[in-house]
């Protein structure tokens, strides 16, 4: 079987994907311009350097991360430096018209370009659950509907919930999660016999999806703490973060061999354990007053996520058609509620000691901010799965799924697989 | 001791264009978000504007959006309010302040704790 | 919205003082209370609802209950007689009660 790309493909990405970029460029051109405003240069180089930390978290951790897969690692890394290129364009865009376009053009900054990386990083926490079973040219669909879906739905809940940029940028893990598996439940879901090995994780992918782990490990307190707006709300997010992390580490490790039989350690529960901290410390990681509480929420968290990872495959698998290695969906579905549970309880707790009159109105807020994120996560998952599933695209064939020759040119080989 | 001093004020027309400074001293000014806010004669407060610590990102009142930029050097501990397209309700007197952050329980707290003595803007033909 | 009442209040030295803010919405306790004299620098006196700005004295209390919050001078001493504004940071655009004018009757 030839390995080429579908004809009907090689005319419809690069047209489909060029025409798109040119429209971004002429959006540019028209309505962004930069800050023009002085500013001290040192302080310049470390807001930047905020910046460069989520592109590493986004480029090399999410892209290594989800490169486990025996035959589709180089299109996992790729097609993820891809969406985020081109997410990021649009959510500097969009983020611009939905919040200052009235005031004329839409004025480009350091923290526009922050918002936009973490944005465009929902995208790849989503795609985890259908990478292998679309095209780049489906790709580009899911990052269009995505990022203006998380735009539409941060600039909503910023407007009626009065919510600042990290509490309402912290929905993303609840949004991608459910965008995710939306998208997935949508998509052709058996693999054809013959097939089924080609979901397998490998060594050397899974090695590289080790380090993916680990870049996302190192550089989760940069995500957590970036759109915090003082130095000690960085500096508390950043501390606890750590702590979450490190303890999630831990018990990743060991409630990975005491869930196994023969004591194993499983690299998929390993892989997206070592996260769990991260991800459940989020919302309310500027908050947490003493490092112990951020370390009880990591053991906490690593242990829902390798109970997740032991349980929940075989019903993804079955339901959503998601392989057992990608199980950044439901993982951050179930950390990103947990996390969002701690906030209202915070929540509660404050209330309290304002006047007991308004604590109901405020869990209320609170749940309908969240239900508010998961129905437009779970409604805009599903159109994009309506789309993906359009002719037009040229979708893989079931038979091709998870197969970097679909997509790749490889010297060394004369014919397809 | 800790110290702002606004300076910059003055006479302008409308629609002409004015930058009041404020100068900190006695902190480490690149640790504090700071803040316009301004006074009209016979009126109350009006917050006008703030600006981060790092200077990443930047928040108006409705009334000067889109005609005033506030932009920091920290290396030289300035804080600078650019005002465009002046009206003459924007006759006041401006003061600066520093932010600080405290850590409630579901939010953290910014308040104004320190304030400058003002400088006068009067827009006028 | 920030409702404050009254607009002008008149009071003699060691009288008690109170003056209410008003939140249109629900703020929790993020509302700050400053003090301002004709000339002078704006003055903080209380921040998150009810915590004393350290060197204010403790005449000055906050409190809050629900929306409600109020400012409340034990003792009126002459220094006091002045402007009071509330202020809320729940969220941005930050905003002002619009002043509480104390005078000396």
């Known amino acids: 079987m030839s390995s080429k790309y579908p004809r009907s493909v090689r005319r419809c990405l690069p047209l489909w994907a060029l025409t798109l970029e040119a429209a971004l460029i002429l959006l540019f051109y028209f309505f962004t311009h930069y800050d023009a405003s002085l500013e001290d240069q040192k302080g310049l180089v470390a807001s930047y350097q905020v910046g460069q930390d989520l592109t590493v978290m986004a480029a090399i951790g999410l892209g290594f991360l989800t490169s486990s897969f025996r035959r589709h690692s180089w299109s996992s890394v790729a097609f993820n430096l891809f969406m985020l290129a081109l997410g990021v364009q649009w959510a500097i865009l969009l983020d611009g018209f939905l919040s200052q376009f009235p005031s004329g053009k839409v004025v480009i900054t350091l923290f526009s370009i922050r918002l936009a990386t973490m944005s465009a990083l929902s995208v790849l926490i989503s795609v985890d659950a259908v990478l292998g079973k679309v095209n780049l040219a489906q790709l580009v669909v899911m990052v269009l509907v995505e990022v203006t879906a998380l735009g539409n739905l941060r600039m909503v809940i910023s407007n009626i919930f009065n919510t600042d940029y990290h509490m309402n940028m912290m929905h993303i893990y609840v949004f991608a999660a459910y965008f995710g598996l939306s998208v997935a439940w949508c998509l052709p879901k058996p693999l054809p016999e013959g097939t089924e090995d080609k979901d397998q994780t490998a060594t050397i992918p899974s090695l590289s999806a080790m380090l993916g782990a680990l870049f996302l490990w190192m550089f989760w307190p940069s995500f957590n703490s970036a759109l915090l707006r003082s130095p000690i709300e960085r500096k508390n997010a950043v501390f606890n973060t750590y702590y979450a992390v490190a303890v999630s580490v831990v018990t990743a490790i060991s409630g990975s061999s005491l869930a196994h039989p023969q004591g194993k350690i499983s690299k998929t529960y390993v892989h997206s354990a070592v996260l769990a901290g991260g991800v459940a410390v989020g919302t309310s990681c500027h908050l947490i007053p003493s490092p112990w509480l951020a370390m009880v929420l990591g053991l906490v968290a690593g242990l829902i996520s390798v109970g997740g990872a032991k349980y929940l495959p075989g019903c993804c698998n079955r339901v959503l058609g998601i392989p057992h290695s990608s199980i950044m969906g439901y993982n951050f579905s179930l950390l990103g509620l947990l996390g969002e549970i701690i906030y209202i309880v915070l929540l509660v707790l404050d209330t309290v000691g304002a006047g007991n009159g308004m604590i109901g109105f405020q869990v209320l807020l609170s749940i309908g901010e969240l239900s508010l994120a998961i129905v437009i996560a779970l409604m805009s998952g599903l159109l994009t799965g309506l789309l993906l599933n359009l002719k037009i695209w040229k979708a893989p064939h079931e038979a091709k799924y998870f197969d970097d020759q679909v997509f790749w040119k490889f010297p060394h080989l004369a014919v397809g697989f | 001791q800790v110290k702002l001093l606004e300076s910059g004020g003055g006479v302008v027309q409308p629609g002409g264009s004015l930058r009041v400074a404020c100068v900190a001293s006695g902190f480490t000014f690149r640790n504090f978000g700071m803040h316009w806010v301004r006074q009209a004669p016979g009126k109350g407060l009006e917050w006008v504007a703030f600006i981060w610590f790092d200077a990443s990102n930047k928040g108006y009142g409705d009334s000067v959006k889109g005609r005033f930029t506030v932009s920091r050097d920290n290396s030289k501990n300035t804080l600078y309010l650019q005002m465009n397209g002046l009206r003459a309700e924007d006759t006041a007197v401006y003061y600066c302040?520093?932010?600080?952050?405290?850590?409630?329980?579901?939010?953290?707290?910014?308040?104004?704790?320190?304030w400058g003595k003002g400088t006068t803007v009067t827009v006028s033909s | 919205v920030m409702t404050q009442s009254p607009s002008s209040l008149s009071a003699s030295v060691g009288d008690r003082v109170t003056i209410t803010c008003r939140a249109s919405?629900?703020?929790?306790?993020?509302l700050n209370w400053y003090q301002h004299k004709p000339g002078k620098a704006p003055k903080l006196l209380i921040h998150t609802a009810s915590s004393l700005q350290s060197g204010v004295p403790s005449r000055f209390s906050g409190s809050v209950s629900g929306t409600d919050f109020t400012l409340t001078i034990s003792s009126l001493q002459p220094e006091d007689f002045a402007t009071y504004y509330c202020?809320?940071?729940?969220?941005?655009?930050?905003?002002f009660g619009q002043g509480t004018k104390l005078q000396i009757k």
């Open positions: 202020q809320q940071s729940y969220t941005t655009p930050y905003t």
């Open positions: 919405q629900s703020i929790i306790r993020y």
């Open positions: 302040a520093r932010e600080k952050a405290v850590r409630g329980i579901s939010r953290y707290n910014y308040y104004m704790d320190v």
